[in-house]
């Protein structure tokens, strides 16, 4: 039961995470104009991975896409790549994890297959989450660097009578969405990996070993191993990962919870 819950929860958390990664990637507010020097600006700038926007106090918003590929900063391209890789891995992970869910029966799929699929999806979710976190962090670092550079420029070159105020950008909502979503996907992946351990059936089924004592035959089963329970054609010897006694549910599955955001 605990394995099923862990796997299911891992799937749901990863799903939320991946949805968040997609949302963050599509959002326009990766960087927003810093309003420290002018909190009542009539023009508000914000930028995303794909376009930049200007919101006027009149109510009009104009967005323009980055129609050049070669003219964009390498860092921005890298962030785009990381986020897309995260999305793709997460999407594949979701697809795999759906079939790996213990509560879903597909033909005569064995527990070992489900365990492998759960582990695969968990790893995909972990990598997906890491990609998202890395992408957002690279962008944040870029913002911090540019912020202090523009601050330095703002206070130099003010010798003339005319002031040219340089627009500085700070963290936008998309960064926080991306960090949280990446974290959720990562956690979901870890949960899926944990669930995989619970799902994996025993490798070795020790047959009852007869010990002749007092002239009686007594079947002795060591505590760390489990005899075949008669589910399916359990002819292979399967080793249980955890030495402790478990319910059938616990042995069968652990929910994995790593989803891409």
């Amino acid at each position: 039961m605990a394995v099923t819950a862990c796997q299911g929860l891992g799937f749901v958390v990863s799903l939320i995470g991946i949805a968040g990664i997609i949302a963050a990637t599509c959002m326009d507010q990766w960087s927003t104009q810093d309003l420290y020097n002018n909190p009542v600006t009539a023009v508000f700038n914000y930028q995303g991975l794909w376009r930049s926007c200007v919101r006027e106090s009149s109510g009009f918003t104009e967005c323009r896409g980055y129609f050049t590929l070669l003219g964009l900063p390498a860092m921005l391209q890298a962030v785009r790549a990381l986020m897309i890789v995260g999305i793709v891995l997460g999407a594949i992970g979701l697809l795999v994890s759906i079939f790996a869910l213990k509560c879903i029966r597909i033909g005569s799929m064995e527990d070992s297959a489900k365990a492998n699929m759960t582990l695969t999806s968990g790893i995909m979710f972990i990598v997906s989450g890491l990609c998202a976190i890395a992408g957002v962090s690279v962008f944040a670092n870029m913002l911090v660097t540019n912020f202090w550079m523009s601050t330095a420029n703002m206070y130099t070159g003010m010798g003339g009578m005319v002031q040219t105020v340089q627009t500085r950008y700070t963290f936008g909502a998309a960064l926080f969405v991306g960090w949280v979503a990446g974290g959720l996907t990562l956690i979901g992946g870890v949960m899926m990996c944990i669930a995989c351990r619970g799902l994996a059936p025993e490798e070795t089924n020790y047959k009852a070993v007869s010990y002749h004592a007092s002239g009686h035959s007594v079947a002795y089963k060591p505590g760390g191993f489990k005899a075949s329970t008669g589910f399916g054609s359990n002819t292979k010897n399967k080793k249980i990962y955890d030495g402790g006694a478990r319910t059938e549910d616990e042995v069968q599955s652990y929910p994995s919870k790593h989803d891409y955001v």
Epitope: T41, S52, S57, G59, E62, T164
Partner: antibody, heavy 118, light 113 residues
Framework: QVTLRESGPALVKPTQTLTLTCTAS????????MSWVRQPPGKALEWVAT????????YYNPSLKDRFTISRDISANQLVLKVTNMDPADTATYFC???????????WGQGTTVTVSS | DIQMTQSPSTLSASVGDRVTITCKSS????????????LTWYQQKPGKAPKLLIY???TRESGVPSRFSGSGSGTAFTLTISSLQPDDFATYYC?????????FGGGTKVEIK
């Protein structure tokens, strides 16, 4: 077509409160920022206040102290300006205007002249 | 606050003349986000409400004759009337639409020579 019509008292005594109303028609009132601009006799235009489309944000001319309050009633398509503690220096023609692209004021009312005198 | 300075304050011209009015701002009105200058030009006739001529420093409002054109960037802007018509005798104002408080220039009165 877009029309803006200001209304309010023509004569106000000093220290009294002035309430001006601008009734809009011909456009989606809640989609545009609205402004009040005034012009003392023989002088230049002076921006007074602006309110955002939904009414969430208000902006005021800091040189006019805190006596001005701009608000809007979206259901009635009305823009309101309240000025407390009126002073003879507030004598002017008050215009309401719609903000458009570039924050430019593309439509203006005909203006209402307010005289502050005892 | 951004100060707007217009010159000249009064301009005498004849019908058919090319007229240029300048407007200077104490800070740049160029927005880096869309590379547009938030400067607006208005025309006002005595006893009437102002009329929008040009926004974004150079974009002509619909219905405004093509003889009116705006140019400039950053802190220096000009309004040009290529061939002055009798209907163009009025007062012209520039306005900062980039930063609150929105500020108007002192105005340039174009009168008949």
């Amino acid at each position: 077509q877009v029309t803006l019509r200001e209304s309010g008292p023509a004569l106000v005594k000093p220290t009294q409160t002035l309430t001006l109303t601008c009734t809009a028609s011909g456009f989606t009132f809640s989609s545009y920022g609205m402004s009040w601009v005034r012009q003392p006799p023989g002088k230049a235009l002076e921006w007074v206040a602006t309110i955002s489309g939904g009414g969430s944000y208000t902006y005021y001319n800091p040189s006019l102290k805190d006596r001005f309050t701009i608000s809007r009633d979206i259901s009635a398509n009305q823009l309101v300006l309240k000025v407390t503690n009126m002073d003879p220096a507030d004598t002017a023609t008050y215009f309401c205007a719609r903000q458009s692209r570039g924050n430019a004021m593309d439509y203006w009312g005909q203006g209402t002249t307010v005289t502050v005198s005892s | 606050d951004i100060q707007m300075t217009q010159s000249p304050s009064t301009l005498s011209a004849s019908v058919g003349d090319r007229v240029t009015i300048t407007c200077k701002s104490s800070q740049s009105l160029l927005n880096s986000g869309n590379q547009k200058n938030y400067l607006t030009w208005y025309q006002q006739k005595p006893g009437k409400a102002p009329k929008l001529l040009i926004y974004w420093a150079s974009t002509r409002e619909s219905g405004v004759p093509s003889r009116f054109s705006g140019s400039g960037s950053g802190t220096a802007f000009t309004l040009t009337i290529s061939s002055l018509q009798p209907d163009d005798f009025a007062t012209y104002y520039c306005q900062n639409d980039y930063s609150y408080p929105l500020t108007f220039g002192g105005g340039t009165k174009v009168e008949i020579k």
